[in-house]
Every structure is written in structure tokens, then in C-alpha cells.
């Protein structure tokens, strides 16, 4: 099952998956001036069997100068916070990465790919956070987030990480985001936490579509 939302945003931190669970999709995005080849894949998909996982489909970009008669499709980007910038894309896997069953490595780059990689994560995916350059980590627990399924809804656990500027003191004036607190203690998968944070409200709502109509006469 796809995770419906983005991993939590931590100020002055970026996240990275060290491995991608089977079922993860990566959009085939091309850099400016390029587009997917006609009838090319929209996405790469991490698939596998009990012994080996790999990325299905190949992303291919071609120059936009050669136009097709029908408009070329652009895959749907995620929101900015779910994107991974190029600096996060180097294969920084730990040594035991290859042996992690049911997971794919970071896919190799393709020619003229976009500067940001857009992933669609699945339940069970773990991402790791680190403070950006110039900030240091104050840990109050694991600096990671896991996409979990609870009561039929997906949600990401809150990483216990605060990134502070080098010049700042370690004294905090109680500005911690309220959404961090539910994750501060162990929780049972059967208990339902209802909080008023945007994230919880988002995940408790069922996705719906409503269609309506307006008509206009041509003058």
C-alpha cells in the first residue's frame, strides 16, 4: 500500500531512504528542456522475488526540441518536501545494503534526469534524517520515520530530531512542534491517537472526489 502523505518535515533537515521497499515507485522525471521518450515509462517500480529485488522499467529522456503531435506526458510530481535533491542521491548505502531482502538500492542515474527524484513510498518504508550543513542534531530519540498502517490509514512516525544552528545554545524555549509528542512513547498498533495536528487530520480523512458542473453558452 502506498503511503498517502509525505514523511514529516523537520526544519533544517533532509531525509533519505537507505533502501527502497518493493512496491516503491520513482517518477521518470526529465530536466528542463527534456521530456520522456514517446511511450516511455512513467515510473520505475521496485519489484522482486524472495532472493532478489530490482527496479522495473527504465526512465529515458529525450530533447524537447523534437516535438510530437500529441503532448508528451509529464509524470505527477510529489510535493517539494517529498522530493530528494541531487545532493541526497549519491549511493550512501551501508555495506550490508545489498543483502537487505525485499528492498532495492538507489537506482542509478539516467541521462538528462531531473535534479530532484520523486518517490512514492510504501507502508513499512523507513527514512533517515540528518541536519543540513551548518546545523547540528539534538536527538531526543531515533532520527528516523517509518510509514505505518493504522486503522486502515497510512501515517509516518515523527522523528525525534531537532536541528540547531552551531551558534545557538542548547537551551530550547519550548518551541517543539506539538506533533512530535505522540511519537515520544511506544505505541500499540491497535490504539488510535487523535490529535489536532494537520498531519493527523489529513490521514484520518477519507480521500474523496466531488464533481459538479457549470454551463456557459457561447455568445
Amino acid at each position: 500500500e502506498l503511503c498517502d502523505d509525505d514523511p514529516p518535515e523537520i526544519p533544517h533537515a533532509t531525509f533519505k531512504a537507505m533502501a527502497y521497499k518493493e512496491g516503491t515507485m520513482l517518477n521518470c522525471e526529465c530536466k528542463r528542456g527534456f521530456r520522456r521518450i514517446k511511450s516511455g515509462s512513467l515510473y520505475m517500480l521496485c519489484t522482486g522475488n524472495s532472493s532478489h529485488s530490482s527496479w522495473d522499467n527504465q526512465c529515458q529522456c529525450t530533447s524537447s526540441a523534437t516535438r510530437n503531435t500529441t503532448k508528451q506526458v509529464t509524470p505527477q510530481p510529489e510535493e517539494q518536501k517529498e522530493r530528494k535533491t541531487t545532493e541526497m542521491q549519491s549511493p550512501m548505502q551501508p555495506v550490508d545494503q545489498a543483502s537487505l531482502p525485499g528492498h532495492c538500492r538507489e537506482p542509478p542515474p539516467w541521462e538528462n534526469e531531473a535534479t530532484e527524484r520523486i518517490y512514492h513510498f510504501v507502508v513499512g518504508q523507513m527514512v533517515y534524517y540528518q541536519c543540513v550543513q551548518g546545523y547540528r542534531a539534538l536527538h531526543r530519540g531515533p532520527a528516523e520515520s517509518v510509514c505505518k498502517m493504522t486503522h486502515g490509514k497510512t501515517r509516518w512516525t515523527q522523528p525525534q530530531l531537532i536541528c540547531t544552528g552551531e551558534m545557538e545554545t542548547s537551551q530550547f524555549p519550548g518551541e517543539e512542534k506539538p506533533q512530535a509528542s505522540p511519537e515520544g512513547r511506544p505505541e500499540s498498533e491497535t490504539s488510535c491517537l487523535v490529535t489536532t495536528t494537520d498531519f493527523q487530520i489529513q490521514t484520518e480523512m477519507a480521500a474523496t472526489m466531488e464533481t459538479s458542473i457549470f454551463t456557459t453558452e457561447y455568445q
Epitope: 502506498l2 498517502d4 502523505d5 509525505d6 512496491g23 515507485m25 511511450s39 516511455g40 515509462s41 512513467l42 515510473y43 517500480l45 519489484t47 522495473d56 522499467n57 503532448k71 506526458v73 509529464t74 509524470p75 505527477q76 510530481p77 510529489e78 510535493e79 517529498e82 512514492h120 489529513q202 480523512m205 477519507a206 480521500a207 474523496t208 472526489m209
Partner: antibody
Framework: PGASVKVSCKAS????????MNWVRQAPGQGLEWMGG????????TYAQGSTGRFVFSSDTSVSTAYLQISSLKPEDTAVYYC???????????WGQGTTVTVSS | WTQSPDTLSVSPGDGATLSCRAS??????VAWYQQRPGQAPRLLIY???TRAAGVPARFSGSGSGTEFTLTISSLQSDDFAVYYC?????????FGQGTKAEIK
């Protein structure tokens, strides 16, 4: 015939800009036909081969709504028009209830 | 992208098998939908064999490459509907023409 119609599709319960929105139509007694979709993040539309010209897809992220505009309506445009959230390999998992457009003189 | 049969006459409680054939290999990139009269389609299966959330276990999908099957193990009264397959490999998305499951 000749008029214009704008069908709206309001999404709720998820981040609107995370997924593309498809438009699918179904003529009376017929099957499902993919008309195309819109990248809700960039507003970039894509049209199926038979949907170019009189059909325009647009979206407004501030109200989490996608739109389908049909101009110069013809009797053969009579159909139920559905919007559906596009999750690629994972299919169209959430559908609107459909809007019936009837073109008659 | 061919779906068969066009119509399937089944007695309640019996099983049913619906087929879809792609003209070229699309691995497991197939979704199945159910559409009851007067309603919007509903996603049943994605990735050829994974049931969508809330779909009863009597629905199962199988296949890979060019041949795909939707199996309903024991038809209940509200399973009598039209079923569509769709390739989810790349745009343009394409649907099968539909299979109507009717009461025998």
C-alpha cells in the same frame, strides 16, 4: 450543441498536489475511456489522442479542484464524466461520483 | 488490449473467471475495476494481484506479461456488475471493453 461546459472535481482527504488527476468518460451503454489527465502540481495537462482540441484540463491547488472544460459541445459528447486520482502502477484508487453531460438540441 | 468474455452468466455462489490480454508484455501493470449500475468504478486489484483496501478476499487477480485474470470465487448478489481491466504501465492508460457479470 455549440455551448460550453465546465465540470469541476473537488478533492479532499489527501494532499491534492501529490497525485495527477485523470478524466474518464463513459458514453451511455459504453465502456470507460481515458480522456487524459493533469499534473496537479504544475498544471500541465496531457490529452488522449481523441481528446485534443475542444477539451481543456486545468486545476486550482488553492481549492484542491481539477476542471474539465468542453467547448463547442456536440451530441456525441453526451456521457458521464469522471475524475479519478492517478496512482500509476497502483491504479485509479479514488473516483468522483460522475457528472452527466447531456447535449441535445 | 482485449477483455473476454463480453458477458458472463453465473449463478450466485458460483465462481467466475475474467480475462484480459495485452498486445505486448506489461509485467504486472494491470488494475481491475468493478462498476455497478449507476455508480462510479471502484478499484479492486492493482499490480495484477494485489487487492485494494476493503476489497473482499473472494476477488483475486493473477497473471504477468500479456495474460491477466480476475477470479471471483463465489459470486454474491452485489458482485453482478461490469468489470474492467486497465493497463497501468504507461500513458495513455487503456481500459478493456468490459465484462458484464449477470445472474444466470
Amino acid at each position: 450543441p455549440g455551448a460550453s461546459v465546465k465540470v469541476s472535481c473537488k478533492a479532499s482527504g489527501y494532499t491534492f498536489t501529490t497525485y495527477a488527476m485523470n478524466w474518464v468518460r463513459q458514453a451511455p451503454g459504453q465502456g470507460l475511456e481515458w480522456m487524459g489527465g493533469i499534473n496537479t502540481n504544475t498544471g500541465d495537462p496531457t490529452y488522449a489522442q481523441g481528446s485534443t482540441g475542444r477539451f481543456v484540463f486545468s486545476s486550482d491547488t488553492s481549492v484542491s479542484t481539477a476542471y474539465l472544460q468542453i467547448s463547442s459541445l456536440k451530441p456525441e459528447d453526451t456521457a458521464v464524466y469522471y475524475c479519478a486520482r492517478d496512482r500509476f502502477h497502483y491504479g485509479m484508487d479514488v473516483w468522483g461520483q460522475g457528472t452527466t453531460v447531456t447535449v441535445s438540441s | 488490449w482485449t477483455q473476454s468474455p463480453d458477458t458472463l452468466s453465473v449463478s450466485p455462489g458460483d465462481g467466475a473467471t475474467l480475462s484480459c490480454r495485452a498486445s505486448e508484455g506489461i509485467r504486472t501493470s494491470v488494475a481491475w475495476y468493478q462498476q455497478r449500475p449507476g455508480q462510479a468504478p471502484r478499484l479492486l486489484i492493482y499490480g495484477a494481484s494485489t487487492r485494494a483496501a476493503g476489497v473482499p478476499a473472494r476477488f483475486s487477480g493473477s497473471g504477468s506479461g500479456t495474460e491477466f485474470t480476475l477470479t471471483i470465487s463465489s459470486l454474491q448478489s452485489d458482485d453482478f456488475a461490469v468489470y474492467y481491466c486497465q493497463q497501468t504501465h504507461t500513458w495513455p492508460w487503456t481500459f478493456g471493453q468490459g465484462t458484464k457479470a449477470e445472474i444466470k
